[in-house]
Interface confidence: low
């Protein structure tokens, strides 16, 4: 009996109720490998999810996120709200980056500006909430009094990715 089931290709299941006949997967289900005794229910892309690839008898549906959200996790298992550049997502929604930090993407967290002085350089272009500083020649190459911006790295609030 086991041998008969192993002959069932992807897109079918081995139907015990019908003497191990290979039956096609019912609508909204799939089997991606041969020899399956059941077909898996297709993933439904609802709510903040939209369909990137329709389900077929041999492969599951693939989801994407609607506009204003981006995928996270295995196989886009969740959607996270986009923020603007210069912001990060907190429990209370999108918040501007603190002074001395920046975020040049719609996702992720605000990061400290580069500390130019660590590389013996000076700040050529000041940082903003959206952009990192641009480091230039070392202070020795500049006129006296030139300085570099070295703000401390901000403390991340307790909620920041606690897990």
């Amino acid at each position: 009996l086991q041998d008969l089931c192993s002959n069932c290709p992807a897109g079918t299941f081995c139907d015990n109720n019908r003497s191990q006949i290979c039956s096609p997967c019912p609508p909204n289900s799939f089997s991606s490998a041969g020899g399956q005794r059941t077909c898996d229910i297709c993933r439904q892309c609802k709510g903040v999810f939209k369909t990137r690839k329709e389900c077929s008898s041999t492969s599951n549906a693939e989801c994407d996120c609607i506009s204003g959200y981006h995928c996270l996790g295995a196989e886009c298992s969740m959607c996270e709200q986009d923020c603007k550049q210069g912001q990060e997502l907190t429990k209370k929604g999108c918040k501007d980056c603190c002074f001395g930090t920046f975020n040049d993407q719609k996702r992720g967290i605000c990061r400290p500006w580069t500390n130019c002085s660590l590389d013996g350089k000076s700040v050529l272009v000041n940082g903003t909430k959206e952009r990192d500083v641009v480091c230039g020649p070392s202070p020795a190459d500049l006129s006296p009094g030139a300085s570099s911006a070295t703000p401390p790295a901000p403390a991340r609030e307790p909620g920041h990715s606690p897990q």
Epitope: A74, M78, L89, K91, G108, G159, P162
Partner: antibody
């Protein structure tokens, strides 16, 4: 596919520090937090701390602050947890697990198989 | 640290039965709660996040509810593969803290 590989077992003598490893593959290592969770035999789960590989930022459970040190080697996509001066209380299964960069509706989406640490002379 | 008190610590239930496990936090955790299932010798697996959201691929017989300090996990119709230990986890504040676990066995 995503994998977090941990050695199945480690044996260490009391007082001799030990470094547990967690090798990541199948994803961009620097973009996901690596967490460490302790489970003593027949007991519950305790969160030790986490590390963000991109900049090695760490959060620690105060209870483990003097016991565990979390580090990463980005070149080999490996996270490490060093336990100092181990005693029998440190004998446990240690799991590494990942969460993504920044998400409050957060889940541990992948786990290592766990390393069983035995502290014995 | 936030203390998570889980009950019962162990229970027996029959196949097809409705099962509910509860978790109480020592303070309001704003629904930042996950539920995990762990089988002997295996890594935990996340079932629910944000108190009531099902992780993709987890059977719909699992559901979560609650707010404030009180939360519950319900299995609408128990199946054999559901036996194991269930843990809740709060992630509203560092450090994240787990409940003590509920061992679910089949009658």
């Amino acid at each position: 596919q995503v994998q977090l590989q941990q050695p199945g077992a480690e044996l260490v003598r009391p007082g001799a520090s030990v470094k547990l490893s967690c090798k990541a593959s199948g994803y961009t290592f620097s973009s996901y937090w690596i967490n460490w969770v302790k489970q003593r035999p027949g007991q519950g789960l305790e969160w030790i701390g986490n590390i963000y590989p991109s900049d090695s930022y760490t959060n620690y459970n105060q209870k483990f602050k003097d016991k565990a040190t979390l580090t990463v080697d980005k070149s080999s996509s490996t996270a490490y947890m060093q336990l100092s001066s181990p005693t029998s209380d440190d004998s446990a299964v240690y799991y590494c697990t990942r969460t993504w960069e920044f998400y409050y509706d957060s889940v541990f989406d992948y786990w290592g198989q766990g390393t069983t640490l035995t502290v014995s002379s | 640290d936030i203390k998570m008190t889980q009950s019962p610590s162990s229970m027996y239930a029959s196949l097809g039965e409705r099962v509910t496990i509860t978790c109480k936090a020592s303070q309001d955790i704003n629904s930042y709660l996950s539920w995990f299932q762990q089988k002997p010798g295996k890594s935990p697996k996340t079932l629910i996040y944000r108190a009531n959201r099902l992780v993709d691929g987890v059977p719909s017989r699992f559901s979560g509810s609650g707010s404030g300090q009180d939360y519950s996990l319900t299995i609408s119709s128990l199946e054999y593969e559901d036996m194991g230990i269930y843990y809740c986890l709060q992630y509203d504040e560092l450090p994240p803290t787990f409940g003590g676990g509920t061992k679910l066995e089949i009658k």
